[in-house]
């Protein structure tokens, strides 16, 4: 039987045009669900803001590699945060849609903060 998690599905509809300072970032999520219009990176800042970024951009690829490297130096308990823990504030250009989705996003966190603009999140049953 498929393993499903009844959690909101995070999707990005547009990407930040600004490069976020690396020092403000805590973690990231990979968005790969086919229910989203595009694959995306959601950066999570130390202030728990979420920002959509284009995974094709070189700076985004560099940042997520740095976050992956830093993750290995952090405590094991901080390696993976649940999606719900990362939904404390609305992401920039992100909509949260209530769907049963087992792997809507993959979260990676590090010990490596924030100014980002949140938009209204939408939760649909």
């Amino acid at each position: 039987q498929p393993d499903a998690v009844n959690a909101p599905l995070t999707c990005c509809y547009s990407f930040t045009s600004k490069m976020i300072p690396m020092s403000r970032l805590e973690s990231y999520k990979r968005i790969t669900s086919s229910r989203c219009p595009k694959e995306a990176v959601v950066f999570v800042t130390k202030l728990k803001r979420e920002v959509c970024a284009d995974p094709k951009k070189e700076w985004v690829q560099t940042y997520i590699k740095n976050l992956d490297r830093n993750q290995m130096r952090s405590e094991p308990t901080t390696l993976f945060k649940t999606a719900s823990a990362l939904r404390s504030s609305a992401p920039l250009n992100v909509k949260l849609t209530r769907k049963s989705e087992a792997n809507a996003s993959t979260t990676f966190s590090t010990t490596t903060s924030s100014t980002s603009v949140g938009v209204t999140s939408v939760t649909v049953n």
């Epitope: 990979r30 790969t32 086919s34 219009p37 694959e39 094709k56 992956d68 290995m72 993976f80 993959t106």
Partner: antibody, heavy 117, light 107 residues
Framework: EVQLQQSGAELVKAGASVKLSCPAS????????MHWVKQRPEQGLEWIGR????????KFDPKFQGKATITADTSSNTAYLQLSSLTSEDTAVYYC??????????WGQGTTLTVSS | DIQMTQSSSSFSVSLGDRVTITCKAT??????LAWYQQKPGSAPRLLIS???SLETGVPSRFSGSGSGKDYTLSITSLQTEDVATYYC?????????FGGGTKLEIK
Amino acid sequence: EVQLQQSGAELVKAGASVKLSCPASGLNIKDTYMHWVKQRPEQGLEWIGRIDPANGNTKFDPKFQGKATITADTSSNTAYLQLSSLTSEDTAVYYCARGVFGFFDYWGQGTTLTVSS
Amino acid sequence: DIQMTQSSSSFSVSLGDRVTITCKATEDIYNRLAWYQQKPGSAPRLLISGATSLETGVPSRFSGSGSGKDYTLSITSLQTEDVATYYCQQFWSAPYTFGGGTKLEIK
């Protein structure tokens, strides 16, 4: 629903070239990377390379450089793999797949290429 | 290039068994590991990405673990439909590379 449609089989003479197609539906190929993977009979998987259809930028495994050309036509939402100077070593199933992060969550059903002498 | 090694190319298993398939990289791949299942005549199917994240629709009897260079795919209670070849793949750096595959066969 994401679907990558590949033709079933191609029979081509040694020394010739072939162009395999991978039309996509349920996604805009400009938003992802399109990859090609080779699987020889009874063997494992080999990554050939990928294209960013938004700008045509490609990246290859060096061992396929000169053998493979990857292109994309965004108007028809299709990725292509061209193989040149075919030999029996090129007899394999060729898969297209999507994935911007380097892993492949959607695959075509594969095109079986047979190179005859 | 990063080489990926799956120590067993095949093994015989019984239905209901707990199965563990290992994969080793020649350098640290920082959890950027995917696992695929392939049945004869079919395309590979992504099971796990990021070493541990189960894809949508994949049964919970599958799990992934590991870090650094060493990774494991586990199946808690093998079902008939799990008989297939399993491949690991690193996506830390291009060229992306696959392990040689581990084929599960019923005893």
